[in-house]
C-alpha cells in the first residue's frame, strides 16, 4: 500500500534538483575564480539540510544559515541591481553591464533561479509531486524562505547608489507585497546606502507618460525617504534601445533619452 503523501497546491520539486544544484555550483565556481575555494558538495549538503526531513510549511531562515554562510561572496556593494517583476530584462542588463550584479548573478541566486524544491516531514525524500504554494498553502515554505533570506542579505550588503528595475506595464509598478517591496526595501542600510534609483521600464512603444509620477512610485519614494535614503527615478521608454546603448554607449543615437 503506498504511503499517504501530502498533496500541495504548487508544482513539485524541479526534476533532477540535486544534480541541477550541484552542476550549477560547479559551473559557477569554474566561471568565477574568486569562488574556486567553494566546496560544491558542502554547498549541496547545506542546501539539502535546510529542507530535507522538515515539514515544508515550517521552514525558517535559520534552516538556511549553513548555506548562507558557505555561499557568502564578495559583490561590489555599489554595483547592485534589484528588480521587481522584470527579471529577464534585469538579467539581460547585467549580462552586458558585467560589473553590475542582480541576486541571480551571485552563487546562491544562480543555484536556485527558477527552481522549486521541498521535502517531507520525517522522511529523507524530496517531494517531486507537489510543493506548498505561497498563497494557497503557506508562506514559510522552502522556496519562499530561501528567497526571503538571500534577498535580505543581498539588500543588507548594498551601499552608495542602489538601482532597482521596475515593470511599468504592471498595475502596481511598485508592489509592497513583492520581494523587493516587502524584504529588500526594508533591509537597505541607511548608513551605507545614499540613494535608491528606480528605473521604470515602459512596455508600449508609444508610451510617453512619466511613470515616475505613478502613485505606487510615490509610495516607494515615501517609504525610502522615511528610511533616510534619497530616491530618484528614471523612465526607460525604450528598453530595447536601452540595452543596445548599454552594449554600445558610443552610438550617436544613445545621447537622446531612452
Amino acid at each position: 500500500v503506498p504511503r499517504w503523501r501530502q498533496q500541495w497546491s504548487g508544482p513539485g520539486t524541479t526534476k533532477r534538483f540535486p544534480e541541477t544544484v550541484l552542476a550549477r555550483c560547479v559551473k559557477y565556481t569554474e566561471i568565477h575564480p574568486e569562488m574556486r575555494h567553494v566546496d560544491c558538495q558542502s554547498v549541496w549538503d547545506a542546501f539539502k539540510g535546510a529542507f530535507i526531513s522538515k515539514h515544508p510549511c515550517n521552514i525558517t531562515e535559520e534552516d538556511y544559515q549553513p548555506l548562507m554562510k558557505l555561499g557568502t561572496q564578495t559583490v561590489p556593494c555599489n554595483k547592485i541591481l534589484l528588480w521587481s517583476r522584470i527579471k529577464d530584462l534585469a538579467h539581460q542588463f547585467t549580462q552586458v553591464q558585467r560589473d553590475m550584479f542582480t541576486l541571480e548573478d551571485t552563487l546562491l541566486g544562480y543555484l536556485a533561479d527558477d527552481l522549486t524544491w521541498c521535502g517531507e516531514f520525517n522522511t529523507s525524500k524530496i517531494n517531486y509531486q507537489s510543493c506548498p504554494d505561497w498563497r494557497k498553502d503557506c508562506s514559510n515554505n522552502p522556496v519562499s524562505v530561501f528567497w526571503k533570506t538571500v534577498s535580505r542579505r543581498f539588500a543588507e550588503a548594498a551601499c552608495d547608489v542602489v538601482h532597482v528595475m521596475l515593470n511599468g506595464s504592471r498595475s502596481k509598478i511598485f508592489d509592497k507585497n513583492s520581494t523587493f517591496g516587502s524584504v529588500e526595501v526594508h533591509n537597505l542600510q541607511p548608513e551605507k546606502v545614499q540613494t535608491l534609483e528606480a528605473w521604470v521600464i515602459h512596455g508600449g512603444r508609444e508610451d510617453s507618460r512619466d511613470l515616475c509620477q505613478d502613485p505606487t512610485i510615490k509610495e516607494l519614494e515615501s517609504i525610502i525617504s522615511k528610511r533616510n535614503i534619497q530616491f530618484s527615478c528614471k523612465n526607460i521608454y525604450r528598453p530595447d534601445k536601452f540595452l543596445q546603448c548599454v552594449k554600445n554607449p558610443e552610438d550617436s543615437s544613445c545621447t537622446s533619452e531612452i
Epitope: E34, M35, H37, D39, S42, D45, A46, G49, E62, Q65, P66, K69, L70, T72, Q73, T74, V75, C77, R153, E156, A157
Partner: antibody
Framework: QVQLVQSGAEVKKPGSSVKVSCKAS????????IEWVRQAPGQGLEWMGD????????DYNEKFKGRVTITADESTSTAYMELSSLRSEDTAVYYC??????????WGQGTLVTVSS | DIQMTQSPSSLSASVGDRVTITCEAS??????LGWYQQKPGKAPKLLIY???NLHTGVPSRFSGSGSGTDFTLTISSLQPEDFATYYC?????????FGQGTKVEIK
C-alpha cells in the same frame, strides 16, 4: 601557507575597551570568514562572532551584542575584534580563526587580555 | 542555543589504545561538526570538519563519524603526542557552540 598572527597581550582596566588584531597571510583574505573565539583561564571555548571581510557581513553571539565589534581591513588583510565595557570575567585568551565548512581550520596564536583594576 | 555535550569529560589511556569520544547535540546539526585538539598554552587545532573529513596534515589514526545529533571522534592507536584536550563544535546555527572538552590523560 595559511597564517594568522595576532597582536600582543594586553592589560586593561574594568570599563575600558580592548582591540585585538589578526593579520592573515597565505590565502585570499576576502574569500573566507574570520571567527573570533575566547577561552577564559582553565575553561572551554566560547564563540564571539565572525566577519566575511569581502562583504563586511558580520554575525555576533547575542551574549556579546553591543559590546563586541568585529571589523576587517582588506588593504592589510587584518581583522579586528573590539570588546568594550570590560569586566574581570572578560579575562581570557582571544583567538581568531579562519572559517572552513562551518568549522575553523587555522587559528591565530591567541592574545591574552587581562582585566584588572 | 544548541548545547553540545561531550563524554567522557576525561579519560585515562595508554599508548596504543583505541580511544572514542562522543559528542551529542541538543538538536539536529546535520553534518556541521568539527573536532579540535588543544594542548596547554596553545591554540586549538582542527582535526575533523564536516563530521568525518580529515583536515590537511592530520594523521589518519584520527577519524570522525555521525550526523544529526550523535557524533564520535576515534583515535585508533593513541600516540604520546595525542594526550591533550579535545573539543567538538557545531556550525549549524548561531551562536556556534563547543562541547565542554574531553581531557585525554596518560594512564
Amino acid at each position: 601557507q595559511v597564517q594568522l598572527v595576532q597582536s600582543g597581550a594586553e592589560v586593561k582596566k574594568p570599563g575600558s575597551s580592548v582591540k585585538v588584531s589578526c593579520k592573515a597571510s597565505g590565502y585570499t583574505f576576502t574569500n573566507h570568514w574570520i571567527e573570533w573565539v575566547r577561552q577564559a583561564p582553565g575553561q572551554g571555548l566560547e564563540w564571539m562572532g565572525d566577519i566575511f571581510p569581502g562583504g563586511g557581513y558580520t554575525d555576533y553571539n547575542e551574549k556579546f551584542k553591543g559590546r563586541v565589534t568585529i571589523t576587517a581591513d582588506e588593504s592589510t588583510s587584518t581583522a579586528y575584534m573590539e570588546l568594550s565595557s570590560l569586566r574581570s570575567e572578560d579575562t581570557a585568551v582571544y583567538y581568531c580563526a579562519r572559517g572552513r565548512d562551518l568549522a575553523m581550520d587555522y587559528w591565530g596564536q591567541g592574545t591574552l587580555v587581562t582585566v584588572s583594576s | 542555543d544548541i548545547q553540545m555535550t561531550q563524554s567522557p569529560s576525561s579519560l585515562s589511556a595508554s599508548v596504543g589504545d583505541r580511544v572514542t569520544i562522543t559528542c551529542e547535540a541538543s538538536q539536529n546539526i546535520n553534518v556541521w561538526l568539527g573536532w579540535y585538539q588543544q594542548k596547554p598554552g596553545k591554540a586549538p587545532k582542527l582535526l575533523i570538519y564536516k563530521a568525518s573529513n580529515l583536515h590537511t596534515g592530520v594523521p589518519s589514526r584520527f577519524s570522525g563519524s555521525g550526523s544529526g545529533t550523535d557524533f564520535t571522534l576515534t583515535i585508533s592507536s593513541l600516540q604520546p603526542e595525542d594526550f591533550a584536550t579535545y573539543y567538538c563544535q557545531q556550525g549549524q546555527s548561531y551562536p556556534y557552540t563547543f562541547g565542554q572538552g574531553t581531557k585525554v590523560e596518560i594512564k
